[in-house]
Interface confidence: low
């Protein structure tokens, strides 16, 4: 992915299509890499990342990674290709419009990760169980 500080007009000729043949152009994601965070014990948090980046490749989605250990809490926001693992995990929820955090097993820390496919969707990371993407009401709100 391009450095997040570089504002870039979309200029590559690669066209990626979804399963319905609809063209997907590069997405907008929060892209602050790893930053210290105060997000803890909340149903949802804002990233507090002021950098919005146009993802380098059309197939990339937004990703957020929340990590807590004995010393600190960090939040990572990036663009990433869902065909490739990130932190050794597959991005299972890349098609979701919202960034719904799911816990992953990592020794020595608490590790949550989410991915999503709407503009800047990794700006609002959701931990609450009530925001399950299998909830038809949520999908109705997003896709109406």
């Amino acid at each position: 992915t391009i450095p997040p500080h570089v504002q870039k007009s979309v200029n590559n000729d690669m066209i990626v299509t979804d399963n319905n043949g609809a063209v997907k152009f590069p997405q907008l994601c929060k892209f602050c890499d790893v930053r210290f965070s105060t997000c803890d014990n909340q149903k949802s948090c804002m990233s507090n990342c002021s950098i919005t980046s146009i993802c380098e490749k059309p197939q990339e989605v937004c990703v957020a990674v929340w990590r807590k250990n004995d010393e600190n809490i960090t939040l990572e926001t990036v663009c990433h290709d869902p065909k490739l693992p990130y932190h050794d995990f597959i991005l299972e929820d890349a098609a979701s419009p919202k960034c719904i955090m799911k816990e992953k097993k990592k020794p020595g820390e608490t590790f949550f990760m989410c991915s999503c496919s709407s503009d800047e969707c990794n700006d609002n990371i959701i931990f609450s169980e009530e925001y399950n993407t299998s909830n038809p009401d949520l999908l109705l709100v997003i896709f109406q």
Epitope: Q7, S9, V10, N11, N12, D13, I15, A22, V23, K24, F25, P26, Q27, L28, K30, S50, I51, T52, I54, P58, P97, S118, D119, E120, C121, D123, V141, I142, Q144
Partner: antibody, heavy 122, light 107 residues
Amino acid sequence: EVQLVESGGGLVQPGGSLRLSCAASGFAFDIYAMTWVRQAPGKGLEWVSVISGSGGTIYYADSVKGRFTISRDNSKNTLYLQMNSLRAEDTAVYYCARRGQYRDIVGATDYWGQGTLVTVSS
Amino acid sequence: DIQMTQSPSSLSASVGDRVTITCRASQSISSYLNWYQQKPGKAPKLLIYAASSLQSGVPSRFSGSGSGTDFTLTISSLQPEDFATYYCQQSYSTPPTFGQGTKVEIK
């Protein structure tokens, strides 16, 4: 049903200011980039500005840069265009439009408001 | 800025005719090309995005083709409600410029 309703247009003298508003309903406003496009009387369409869902990314046309400011209030589902130092050539119908979710911030606009007329004249 | 040039600027046609409007970009824009229809006193309406993808709810008589610098909007059988002005727009780079429009009038 997606609806976009512009307001705030009117007659203003050269050098004056106006603030346009666009009230959005029927969709999840905060995840859509929004644009302003204008059309001078009897002329074609001219893109003015775009703002991403959170307001984190903004672009302007060179013709309005430094004079116009786009903003949004996601809690009110409202898009704004603050227009300062207005000129006669800014006279146009101003449309607010929703950028379709085609992953390109300056991409196709799938829903448009009815427009509001701004007339700059002494 | 990328210049978009439409031709013709106007045309006269009859109901049932096949109508073709072309749009040329001043540099390659891949498939980042959209088509809009505008009727007098109304807002534009998206017909085609990404050069050839039909927007939801748009009749199948509208189709788009092309890539690079040359694009075409085709109306296979002109209907009374199709008399309007048509605009192309590139969304390859900022600013997303429009063509000057093609007015389709009744012969």
